[in-house]
Interface confidence: medium
């Protein structure tokens, strides 16, 4: 959460001299309340915009717009505090619009905009516009808040932003997962144009539950340049899990631009369809059946015979 670096922050408009200042998010009117305070903003509109930084990076920014109510309280409006709170970290960033001249009624409703809050993909923010001065302790609130969820890097508009491209958004692995038999899953995906390794996490779940009953990790070494953009396939050996039939395959790349934090792609294989007249279910459900002829201990990442190869 930061401000767009190079822009001169402007809030003046015809009929109003205004300057934008950094704010500590604690306006002086909290400490020294005023008797007469303006009413709250009428409407807040928030949408996503993409702007370029002085280094030429494309970054997602919040475009915040609000209007004033048409009441006499605008005579006491000295400015506004804009606050953006990132909900998962409680990080807050504020700026202050400081009006250097008195507002007067004119033929159009007063409207203000600000488009300099740089945000992160797939994060939720609370945007608050507080009219200044803030109300006395028991006074009517004169702010409005709205939540805004920034789309993730799958979103077409976000895909081309620098933070998304850095995390591998341009790679589309086009994963396919196929059940070969009760003990094998075949995973196919397209390699990216970088000599970096991949990790496949297989997580299995009972039919209607969300706690995992089995996990296995498979490592894929870095492909050679001639294998870039080619399909790679991996056969994973299951532990023949009984009642543990829904399999989620997640592929994690380790691109140089994002290392451990690259975007992961998933595909899921559902449990087989239940027959119309199901057999009576016992009052317990073992998670897997005996394996034949294998003495290799298979748990977590030790899945025995998983193997892979790349092909054109």
């Amino acid at each position: 959460l930061r401000l767009l670096d190079h822009r001169a922050l402007v809030c003046s408009q015809p009929g109003l001299n205004c300057t934008v200042k950094n704010s500590t998010c604690l306006d002086d009117s909290w400490i020294h309340p005023r008797n007469l305070t303006p009413s709250s903003p009428k409407n807040i509109y928030i949408n996503l915009s993409v702007s370029s930084t002085q280094h030429g990076e494309l970054v997602p920014v919040l475009h915040v717009e609000w209007t004033l109510q048409t009441d006499a309280s605008i005579l006491y409006l000295e400015g506004a505090e804009l606050s953006v709170l990132q909900l998962n970290t409680n990080e807050r960033l504020c700026v202050r619009f400081e009006f250097l001249s008195k507002l007067r009624h004119h033929h159009r409703r007063w409207r203000f905009t600000f488009s300099h809050f740089v945000v992160d993909p797939d994060q939720e923010y609370e945007v608050t516009v507080h009219h200044l001065p803030k109300p006395i302790p028991d006074g009517d609130p004169n702010h409005q808040s709205k939540n805004f969820l920034v789309p993730d890097c799958e979103h077409a508009r976000m895909k081309v932003t620098t933070p998304c491209m850095s995390s591998g958004s341009l790679w589309d692995p086009n994963i396919t997962v196929e059940t070969l038999d009760t003990q094998h899953l075949r995973v196919d995906f397209t390699l990216w144009n970088e000599s970096t390794h991949y990790q496949i996490l297989l997580t299995s779940f009972p039919h209607m539950e969300n706690h995992s009953c089995f996990e296995h990790m498979h490592h894929i070494p870095a492909p050679r340049p001639e294998e870039f953009h080619q399909r790679s396939n991996v056969t994973l050996t299951l532990r023949n899990l009984k009642g543990c039939c829904r399999h989620q395959v997640q592929i994690q790349p380790f691109f140089s631009s994002c290392l451990n934090d690259c975007l992961r792609h998933s595909a899921t294989v559902s449990c087989p369809e239940m027959p119309d007249t199901p057999e009576p279910i016992p009052d317990y459900m073992p998670l897997w059946e005996p394996r034949s002829g294998s003495s290799d201990y298979k748990d977590d990442d030790d899945k025995g015979s998983s193997h892979h190869h790349h092909h054109h």
Partner: antibody
Framework: QVQLVQSGAEVKKPGASVKVSCKAS????????ISWVRQAPGQGLEWMGW????????NYAQKLQGRVTMTTDTSTSTAYMELRSLRSDDTAVYYC?????????WGQGTLVTVSS | EIVMTQSPATLSVSPGERVTLSCRAS??????LAWFQQKPGQAPRPLIY???TRAAGIPARFSGSGSGTDFTLTISSLQSEDFAVYYC?????????FGGGTKVEIK
Amino acid sequence: QVQLVQSGAEVKKPGASVKVSCKASGYTFTRYGISWVRQAPGQGLEWMGWISAYSGNTNYAQKLQGRVTMTTDTSTSTAYMELRSLRSDDTAVYYCARRQLYFDYWGQGTLVTVSS
Amino acid sequence: EIVMTQSPATLSVSPGERVTLSCRASQSVSSNLAWFQQKPGQAPRPLIYDASTRAAGIPARFSGSGSGTDFTLTISSLQSEDFAVYYCQQYDNWPLTFGGGTKVEIK
């Protein structure tokens, strides 16, 4: 060599919480799950639950559901087990162990005493 | 949950003797069974997994057998360092469960 090193003994009052740590070394932490097992004085072993060090997926024993939380910090290769609303019958040695199903390496154990 | 029952609770034997420990599951656990050895003040030590496979570094005198509901841990010739408590554990079904243990003590 693989090692799981647990935090030191704790004495807690009933109703309090305890958080036991388990620092792993000698292997790639995210490749294996961490399970927690406890043993009351003079008693047998009781499975408490498991956490995937890779995905954070968990599976808890039904009787501890709502009181136990297992977490990992991959940056320090450390697993944590927090038990809340402690009762006197939670007095036990708490072990972390590597893997999800069968436990091939164990921590040295952490004695948690719950007493008023 | 699957209940694991071990017998006997205590076994008094002399060094050099052959020892057979029993573990019974309340329902089939196929071959998803492990054996552990625990000495006082120490963490359990893995001996056997998948009912019959010895863990790394475990001497050949330890062997496991059985599948379904009945399992056996055999120590062919008991050494002085083998006096301990032995636990079986099933991992066929959640929750994972342990037997109550068999204490092998010096006669």
